[in-house]
């Protein structure tokens, strides 16, 4: 993979009730930070559901963050670990308008990577993921 | 292709580097079905605390 | 009991579009995917998309894409799809089902409404 | 696309008899699910991932397979199994089903 040209979002989805970020431009090192949610739909996606069998669900619920780890400081790092992962899309051409978070092809794939994330890890004590980066493989 | 790379936060002691990528692995499939995103080459690697939004140009597995 | 109750039959001329919803009970909405899927007269059943009302997020396939819009009401606990610029070959039966996100998606569409005949004829 | 063959496309069948329908795949799959349908009422699930059977189905229908290849059997076919049945795969975006296979009294 090359090429230097990106686009990242350096906030945090997170599988609480989002909020407004309450950070200041002068954290900006730090990628962590809650985002009003994607869609219109206010939502709530610590809510698990577990199949048992074709006709019944159970639910559970991942406790949201608390306000306590929303901090900006290098205290976050008290209790939290960080992993960095990539990975590639085949199927998909990197183009300009994953330089440009405004686009609607930005916006449909960040959405989708972060609700896969917020389901695959959603049992494990996963608090969410954060500054998404595209570019060309 | 296009190349995603970003940070993923739990909390500390819930898993490790290698359970992340292999439950990430275990739904490449699910994703491709659900979002039409063929998944390949994944990496993961821990990341050391305190660490900028601009520390992610390389990485190691 | 979870149930999925669509609206009825719509008879539509080429050009116009019908909205069709689904409204669910018997389980908590949010949590589930809704999926659209058709069937025409003697043929065999086609995916048209799905929508998570956890967070409004759709996709499409992309035979329908710029006709089909996928849409919900989380307070009325209702999916709607809606098909434009309808044409003859639109005559089907269609079918809302939810099914479930990772990590159960495995389990499949296991509850389907009864389905709306969509009859497109000048 | 994946492309779903079914084979038998109908099959005539009298109570009791062993019955079984393959499902093809154009390219490998991880799994597929199972629907069957009556006329006029919508496709019920009626086995998920390959080989579980769906709550509410008799344990005398089984399905198994992988790759490309898999099948759904009943092993005494009772009044109530003549139905049209559908294979579906998800491994790849858009899912798709199969043509059916109508399942007729002899």
């Known amino acids: 993979a090359s090429g230097s040209a990106s686009g990242s979002a350096s906030t945090l989805v997170h599988n609480g009730t989002s909020a407004r970020a309450t950070t200041t431009p002068a954290s900006k090192s730090t990628p962590f930070s809650i985002p009003s949610h994607h869609s219109d739909t206010p939502t709530t996606l610590a809510s698990h559901s577990t199949k048992t069998d074709a006709s019944s669900t159970h639910h559970s619920s991942v406790p949201p963050l608390t306000s306590s780890n929303h901090s900006t400081s290098p205290q976050l790092s008290t209790g939290v670990s960080f992993f960095f992962l990539s990975f590639h899309i085949s199927n998909l051409q990197f183009n300009s308008s994953l330089e440009d978070p405004s686009t609607d092809y930005y916006q449909e794939l960040q959405r989708d990577i972060s609700e896969m994330f917020l389901q695959i890890y959603k049992q494990g004590g996963f608090l969410g993921l954060s500054n998404i980066k595209f570019r060309p493989g | 292709s296009v190349v995603v790379q970003l940070t993923l936060a739990f909390r500390e002691g819930t898993i490790n580097v290698h359970d992340v990528e292999t439950q990430f692995n275990q739904y490449k499939t699910e994703a491709a079905s659900r979002y039409n995103l063929t998944i390949s080459d994944v990496s993961v690697s821990d990341v050391p605390f305190p660490f900028s939004a601009q520390s992610h140009h390389h990485h190691h597995h | 009991e979870v149930q999925l109750v669509q609206s009825g039959a719509e008879v539509k001329k080429p050009g116009a579009s019908v909205k069709v919803s689904c409204k669910a009970s018997g389980y908590t909405f949010t949590d589930n995917y809704i999926n659209w899927v058709r069937q025409a007269p003697g043929q065999r059943l086609e995916y048209m998309g799905w929508?998570?009302?956890?967070?409004?997020?759709?996709k499409f396939n992309e035979k329908f894409k710029g006709r089909v819009t996928i849409t919900v009401d989380t307070s009325a606990s209702t999916a709607y799809m809606e098909l434009s610029s309808l044409r003859s070959e639109d005559t089907a039966v269609y079918y809302c089902a939810r099914d479930y996100p990772f990590p159960s998606y495995h389990y499949g569409m296991d509850y389907w409404g009864q389905g709306t005949t969509v009859t497109v004829s000048s | 696309d994946i492309q779903l063959t079914q084979s038998p496309s109908s099959l005539s069948a009298s109570v009791g008899d062993r019955v079984t329908i393959t499902c093809s795949a154009s390219s490998s799959v991880s799994y597929i699910h199972w629907f069957q349908q009556k006329p006029g009422t919508s496709p019920k699930l009626w086995i998920y991932s390959t080989s579980n059977l769906a709550s509410g189905v008799p344990p005398r229908f089984s399905g198994s397979g992988s790759g490309t290849s898999f099948t759904l059997t009943v092993s005494s076919l009772q009044p109530e199994d003549f139905a049209t049945y559908y294979c579906?795969?998800?491994?790849?975006?858009?899912?798709?089903f199969g043509g059916g296979t109508k399942v007729e009294i002899k």
């Open positions: 929508i998570y009302p956890g967070s409004g997020n759709n």
């Open positions: 579906q795969q998800r491994s790849s975006y858009p899912p798709t």
